[in-house]
């Protein structure tokens, strides 16, 4: 979390940036909120991105403000209009691209005053695993299958019955380079698997983790998955 | 406790159609890859279909592909076999089967259902 | 596909006695093998699943062993409910899924 405060001229005002990641391809949210003023004219928006020579965004008197924004940007921004009385002064980022990261700084001005802070925005590419029985495989095997990731992760097995085993030895996993050459599927085989356990495959890179487990008994298989995007901080 | 109940059994002419079903209940039917298997009358065993647990993948034995259907309803927990164009050699009692947990033995059979081709 | 051959196809034995029954695999299938039984007018049960695991409520006189090719089913005290029909099913390689041929198990 990161909380700025105005300098010189006016008065200071608060805001409040967190640091967040984007996933490739996909629209993402830089988030950052202010002290809320009572005027919507009064407000004015910019958002600037270290080494970038134009606006990201702008947003003056009620409306998008574009005529200095960066090329790079250009049809891809978005505050959330209705919100900004409330003082919400969020982007929307939309087709994320690796490029996008780096250092953003929000900026606000009101009638109360000015004020800025900074926001550390990561790029790459993490999804969901899921894991299954591969009934095809000539032994008790579970394969775990997650489309888009990037950075390249590292994968873990991992057991409710045998914790603490290291399960490298009896898994296999390989990285298949998607048609946009930038993600990567990830498939990972744990062989040997047991009856009666839950197993679970845990994806990471420096912007994600990500776990699907599996329970195996005779009368149910339970998939469950869940995702956690890493240093989360606000400023 | 797992429970299979076929239905949809009987006397047929060669040629024509028929449709089982198989009702599950007593485990978590759209977790589990699901069979049928059958029994000429005083013969042995012979697997006829699969059909994975969310119905993305369905095999056959060569002695019916192009002629059966298996297929799922996971809403209703039942499997259905589609049997079509049928021949005297089809004659059997038809089971359906749940697969193990994780290899395709079959852990748990139906009480079956006789199918009889006969002009 | 995968051939699986039963031996005997019919074995006599008294109550009492060790029953021993056979089933060969036309290639190697690991410990991937399944015994059923099948009395009759009834659905086979499964007895022995991965060549040697018991089922589920399975009794401790019946067992499995064996791998690769090779493969027996012993009933170690024949019991008067044993008295049936006896399949052995491989499924390291499908489709097909294959059973052998059975072996009836009758009284003496």
């Known amino acids: 979390l990161i909380i700025g405060f105005g300098i010189s001229g006016r008065h200071s005002i608060t805001v409040t940036t967190v640091a967040s990641a984007g996933n490739i391809g996909e629209d993402g949210i830089l988030s950052c909120t202010f002290e809320p003023d009572i005027k919507l004219s009064d407000i004015v928006i910019q958002w600037l991105k270290e080494g970038v020579l134009g606006l990201v965004h702008e947003f003056k008197e009620g409306k998008d403000e574009l005529s200095e924004q960066d090329e790079m940007f250009r049809g891809r921004t978005a505050v959330f209009a209705d919100q900004v009385i409330v003082g919400n002064a969020s982007l929307r980022l939309k087709n994320v691209q690796l490029t996008d990261a780096g250092t953003y700084k929000c900026y606000i001005i009101t009638s109360k005053g000015k004020g800025n802070a900074n926001l550390e925005y990561k790029t790459g590419a993490f999804s969901m695993p899921e894991v299954n029985v591969d009934y095809n495989a000539s032994s008790e095997t579970l394969r775990c299958e997650a489309p888009r990731w990037f950075p390249q992760p590292t994968v873990v097995w991992a057991s409710q019955v045998d914790q603490g085993a290291n399960f490298s030895e009896v898994s296999n996993t390989s990285f298949e380079l998607n048609s946009e050459n930038v993600t990567m599927k990830v498939v990972s085989v744990l062989y040997n698997v047991t009856i009666n356990n839950t197993y679970s495959c845990m994806i990471e890179n420096d912007i994600a983790k990500a776990t699907g487990d599996i329970k195996v008994t005779e009368s149910e298989i339970k998939r469950r998955s869940h995702l956690q995007l890493l240093n989360s901080k606000a400023s | 406790q797992v429970q299979l109940v076929e239905s949809g059994g009987g006397v047929v002419q060669p040629g024509r159609s028929l449709r089982l079903s198989c009702a599950a209940s007593g485990f978590t039917f759209r977790s589990f890859g699901m069979h049928w298997v059958r029994q000429a009358p005083g013969k042995g065993l012979e697997w006829v279909a699969v059909?994975?647990?969310?119905?993305?993948?369905?095999y056959y034995a060569d002695s019916v592909k192009g002629r059966f259907i298996i297929s799922r309803d996971n809403s209703k927990d039942t499997l259905y076999l589609q049997m079509n164009s049928l021949r005297a050699g089809d004659t059997a009692v038809y089971y359906c089967?749940?697969?193990?947990?994780?290899?395709?033995?079959?852990?748990?059979w139906g009480q079956g259902t006789l199918v009889t081709v006969s002009s | 596909e995968i051939v699986m051959t039963q031996s005997p196809a019919t074995l006599s034995v008294s109550p009492g006695e060790r029953a021993t029954l056979s089933c060969r695999a036309s290639?190697?299938?690991?410990?991937?093998l399944g015994w059923y039984q099948q009395k009759p007018g009834q659905a086979p049960r499964l007895l022995i699943y991965?060549?040697?695991t018991r089922a589920t409520g399975i009794p401790a006189r019946f067992s499995g062993s064996g791998s690769g090719t090779e493969f027996t089913l012993t009933i170690s005290s024949l019991q008067s409910e044993d008295f049936a029909v006896y399949y052995c099913q491989q499924y390291q390689s499908w489709p097909p899924l294959t059973f052998g041929g059975g072996t009836k198990v009758e009284i003496k």
């Open positions: 991965g060549a040697s």
């Open positions: 059909i994975s647990y969310d119905a993305s993948n369905e």
């Open positions: 290639q190697s299938i690991s410990s991937n």
């Open positions: 089967a749940k697969g193990g947990g994780l290899r395709w033995y079959f852990a748990y």
